[in-house]
Every structure is written in structure tokens, then in C-alpha cells.
């Protein structure tokens, strides 16, 4: 599940990883667009093991995965789901 959140919080990510994470380990991916107190786009991966990792938006693997998910979402709904949450 891919989620796009708009929040009024500052940046959430202190450290970012560029290491590939297999889909079967991922619960959901949260995208925090640039703005609202944070000057950069942030991507947070919530894993099935209950841990969370911030992913470098420039990491090749996440860009490739997002492209696959975008293509899939335009042809097959409802997975993945794009959610916009405005507090």
C-alpha cells in the first residue's frame, strides 16, 4: 500500500537508507511531500517486522518500485491505495 501524506510536522527522517527492501518485507510505504516545515520529500517504509526505515528518495530501487506501483495503480485498483491525509 502506497500512502501520500500531507502533514504540518517538521522532517521525520534523520537517517536515510538506499538499500533494497524486498516487497515481502514491506507493510506499507508512506510518502511525505516536500513543504510544510520540511524542505525535502521523505519516504518512510513500514516493515512487517514493525520497524520503520526512511529511504533516500533518490535511491534507484525505490524510484523503480514507485514507478511499478504507479503503473499498477493506474490499471488495477484498489491496490495500491494513494491516501491524502490533511490534519
Amino acid at each position: 500500500v502506497l500512502e501520500v501524506y500531507y502533514t504540518s510536522l517538521r522532517c521525520r527522517c534523520v537517517q536515510e537508507s538506499s538499500v533494497f527492501i524486498p516487497r515481502r518485507f514491506i507493510d506499507r510505504i508512506q510518502i511525505l511531500p516536500r513543504g510544510n516545515g520540511c524542505p525535502r520529500k521523505e519516504i518512510i517504509v513500514w516493515k512487517k517486522n514493525k520497524s520503520i526505515v526512511c529511504v533516500d528518495p533518490q535511491a534507484e530501487w525505490i524510484q523503480r518500485m514507485m514507478e511499478v506501483l504507479r503503473k499498477r495503480s493506474s490499471s488495477t485498483l484498489p491496490v495500491p491505495v494513494f491516501k491524502r491525509k490533511i490534519p
Epitope: 537508507s17 538506499s18 538499500v19 533494497f20 527492501i21 524486498p22 516487497r23 515481502r24 518485507f25 516493515k47 512487517k48 517486522n49 520497524s51 534507484e60 530501487w61 523503480r64 518500485m65
Partner: antibody, heavy 120, light 107 residues
Framework: EVQLVESGGGLVQPGGSLRLSCAAS????????MSWVRQAPGKGLEWVAE????????NYAPSLKDRFTISRDNAKNSLYLQMNSLRAEDTAVYYC?????????????WGQGTTVTVSS | DIQMTQSPSSLSASVGDRVTITCKAS??????VTWFQQKPGKAPKLLIY???YRYTGVPSRFSGSGSGTDFTFTISSLQPEDIATYYC?????????FGGGTKLEIK
């Protein structure tokens, strides 16, 4: 120091069964996905199965899933592979491996293997 | 299943040589590729993960690159202790699959 020690291998007749064990130490076993990988004599590596910490996500090599069952006992820090209806082509060294799903996301620690020989 | 086609199956090189092994996936595996080293009678050892990241303690002469379907493993300057069989593996999706291996020998 992380240690994975396989046991339970041996000589078994075709059609027979065997249960392999993998005892883990030096890691928080209950946190990690685990896999079995095998290697036939003089051949390459073949992934057999994997299991997540809660035992609710299990995947098998399609050709083996009807005969092999992976399981674990977190209280005993142990991983198991139940092998039924064994065939000559199951003869191999069987390795257990930890799958790190925190930072590497790959099989980073391996045991030394246990040998299974299926022969009449 | 995703097939991993590794080449060459064997190669002979001299100490100090640059050695390159390639692996081709039958479909896109993103950067979900590892490289293992296996010496006779021993368990495989993880060298490279996520296509290009060196595992802890692995010498800098070992490197990996690639994404999608084409991957490369390189030893920049071959050492005698590097004599082993090397395997690529995709962990993008299950069933996890390995390449057929490359047996590396010293000339």
C-alpha cells in the same frame, strides 16, 4: 558470535522421511526470517523455503512445497525442515540461513550444513 | 520463477587480474541481487547485497553493480584467497533463485 548449526541429516531410503534441525545462538532468533538452502553434490545452490518470525508467512520452492515443510520454535531457537517422500535427487547438503530483514534484507549468516543422502 | 543466468561458468585468471562475472535475470529484479562466495566444503559467504553494497568485513576489491536485469560482480585485483565459486542470487521475489555459479581458478 552468531552460530547456526544444522543436524538431522543422514542416509535414508527413497520414499522415506527426515527432519532437519537448525539450532541458532548469538542472535535474537525470534526476530528473523529464516531459510533453508540446499546444494546437491557438485551442483549449485537451490533455495528450499523461508519462514518469518511469527510463522505466518511461509514460502517454498514450487517443486518442493508438496513434500517439504518448514517450521520453527522460537522458544527453542530452532528451525526445522520436515522432508517426506524423499527421492534420490534430494541428496544434498542442506544449509539454514538467517534472512536479515532489518538492514541487509538478504541471507547474511549460514550454518555449515548437514548432509542428506537418499539411496537404497 | 525468475531465472538467473550467470556467466562464465568457469574462468582462469592470474593474481592481480581484474575479474568480472555477469548475471542476467529473466525479468526485472530491481536491485534485489546478492553475490556469494563459496569455498569447497564450506557454506556460502555474503559479499554483496542490494546489487552494489559490500557486506561488513568484505575487502574493497569486491564490488557489484547493476539494476533491472543486468548485474556485474568484479574483483579488481585477484588474490590467491579469492579462489572459490561465486553465485549471484535474486531476492526480489520468491522463489528466491541463484545463478549457476562461476568457478574461479588461478592460472
Amino acid at each position: 558470535e552468531v552460530q547456526l548449526v544444522e543436524s538431522g541429516g543422514g542416509l535414508v531410503q527413497p520414499g522415506g522421511s527426515l527432519r532437519l534441525s537448525c539450532a541458532a545462538s548469538g542472535i535474537d532468533f525470534s526476530r528473523y526470517w529464516m531459510s533453508w538452502v540446499r546444494q546437491a553434490p557438485g551442483k549449485g545452490l537451490e533455495w528450499v523455503a523461508e519462514i518469518n518470525p511469527e510463522s505466518n508467512f511461509i514460502n517454498y520452492a514450487p517443486s518442493l512445497k508438496d513434500r517439504f515443510t518448514i517450521s520453527r520454535d522460537n522458544a527453542k531457537n530452532s528451525l526445522y525442515l520436515q522432508m517426506n517422500s524423499l527421492r534420490a535427487e534430494d541428496t544434498a547438503v542442506y544449509y539454514c540461513a538467517r534472512q536479515d530483514d532489518y538492514s541487509v534484507y538478504a541471507m547474511d549468516y549460514w550454518g555449515q550444513g548437514t548432509t542428506v543422502t537418499v539411496s537404497s | 520463477d525468475i531465472q538467473m543466468t550467470q556467466s562464465p561458468s568457469s574462468l582462469s585468471a592470474s593474481v592481480g587480474d581484474r575479474v568480472t562475472i555477469t548475471c542476467k535475470a529473466s525479468q526485472d529484479v530491481n536491485t534485489g541481487v546478492t553475490w556469494f562466495q563459496q569455498k569447497p566444503g564450506k557454506a556460502p559467504k555474503l559479499l554483496i547485497y542490494s546489487a552494489s553494497y559490500r557486506y561488513t568485513g568484505v575487502p574493497s576489491r569486491f564490488s557489484g553493480s547493476g539494476s533491472g536485469t543486468d548485474f556485474t560482480f568484479t574483483i579488481s585485483s585477484l588474490q590467491p584467497e579469492d579462489i572459490a565459486t561465486y553465485y549471484c542470487q535474486q531476492y526480489y521475489s520468491t522463489p528466491l533463485t541463484f545463478g549457476g555459479g562461476t568457478k574461479l581458478e588461478i592460472k
